[in-house]
């Protein structure tokens, strides 16, 4: 039986909502794109665009799809087997130690420093001292040059334990 709910299943709205697709667990587990039923005897398909599961599992429900925040762009939509992939908009980045929000990239390096790395969706511009070549992570730049971001790696999906 097909694991995914097809486009037909999602519309038109006047049709009765389709039954979620079912199959039997294999060794107690359901395939990606499914969760296990309350009695553990069926695998129930996740709802396309609403929830997902990425691995063989015995979860009693599928995981909610992430919604990209304002300030983020959707790189790829949520499917039944993969969460939404969101990325910071151009000119902003997400730091590892504050992954909950995109921050504006600095527009230039402080005096006496040169830019060696562009603003990307996952890092601010990188500045080094002209002479020594040592990195600088100061927060208050002089506006000397603007930078643009290049496409980058996606943010990882949130974990259950929130």
């Amino acid at each position: 039986e097909s694991a995914l709910i097809t486009q037909q299943d999602l519309a038109p709205q006047q049709r009765a909502a389709p039954q979620q697709k079912r199959s039997s667990p294999s060794e107690g587990l359901c395939p990606p794109g499914h969760h296990i039923s309350e009695d553990g005897r069926d695998c129930i398909s996740c709802k396309y665009g609403q929830d997902y599961s990425t691995h063989w599992n015995d979860l009693l429900f599928c995981l909610r799809c992430t919604r990209c925040d304002s300030g983020e762009v959707e790189l790829s939509p949520c499917t039944t087997t993969r969460n939404t992939v969101c990325q910071c908009e151009e000119g902003t980045f997400r730091e590892e130690d504050s992954p909950e929000m995109c921050r504006k990239c600095r527009t230039g390096c402080p005096r006496g420093m040169v830019k060696v790395g562009d603003c990307t969706p996952w890092s601010d511009i990188e500045c080094v001292h002209k002479e020594s070549g040592t990195k600088h992570s100061g927060e208050v730049p002089a506006v000397e040059e603007t930078v643009t971001s290049s496409p980058g790696t996606p943010a990882s999906p949130c974990s259950l334990s929130g």
Epitope: P25, G28, I36, G40, D51, D58, L59, S161
Partner: antibody, heavy 122, light 112 residues
């Protein structure tokens, strides 16, 4: 450490409603089901149902549908059970209990609240 | 619903001696996935139940190894190898193979 602390005893008149609370601490509240059990005086335990704090789903024992309503307040990590149209047979100690989100490990309660006595008397 | 029965309903014990409680279900508790979802709880006087054994024979963390569970199908046993004074209370078996989950009537263990 994991703790489930329930609200105090209640005395209610027949026909009234009561709302029992269960405040969770020491673990990620949205990471586990919250179940409710009934223990009538001198009797065994009955499973009422469970609430999924992650997505808001409820799953009830058919016997308690229409009698119990399960909710949570995620901001305070508190689960609630409201019992409506109370009758004398609803007099019991009610327990909350935590269970896992997985079928294979989700059918038993690893931590319990201390219990709340609800007495229905005219 | 699955009916769980326990015997005896009352069990006077001597500290240091072994004790055994039987639990039977009205239908097999072997799930189609091959696992058996039979659990044991102890409710000490004035307290809430506490998990002792899950899935027939697995001791929950912190449970002393004098407690052991066994059985299959519809017949299950909880054994205490050497009863201690702190083991008094009501022991319940419970099943989660079939919805709704159900409990046995309990076995009251008391010191002779």
């Amino acid at each position: 450490q994991v703790q489930l602390v329930q609200s105090g005893a209640e005395v209610k008149k027949p026909g009234a409603s009561v709302k029992v609370s269960c405040k969770a601490s020491g673990y990620s509240f949205i990471g586990y089901f919250m179940n409710w059990m009934k223990q009538s005086p001198g009797k065994s335990l009955e499973w009422i149902g469970r609430f999924n704090p992650y997505n808001g789903d409820t799953f009830y024992n058919q016997k308690f549908k229409g009698k119990a309503t399960l909710t949570v307040d995620k901001s305070t990590s508190t689960a609630y059970m409201e019992l409506s149209s109370l009758r004398s047979e609803d007099t019991a100690v009610y327990f909350c209990g935590r269970s896992a989100y997985y079928f294979d490990s989700g059918g038993y309660f690893d931590y319990w609240g201390q219990g709340t006595l609800v007495t229905v008397s005219s | 619903d699955i009916v769980m029965t326990q015997s005896p309903l009352s069990l006077p014990v001597t500290p240091g001696e072994p004790a055994s409680i039987s639990c039977r279900s009205s239908q097999s508790l072997v799930h189609s996935n091959g696992n058996t979802y039979l659990h044991w709880y102890l409710q000490k006087p004035g307290q809430s139940p506490q998990l002792l054994i899950y899935k027939v024979s697995n001791r929950f963390s912190g449970v002393p190894d004098r407690f052991s569970g066994s059985g299959s199908g519809t017949d299950f046993t909880l054994k205490i190898s050497r009863v201690e004074a702190e083991d008094v209370g009501v022991y319940y078996c419970s099943q989660s193979t079939h919805v709704p989950w159900t409990f046995g009537p309990g076995t009251k263990v008391e010191i002779k």
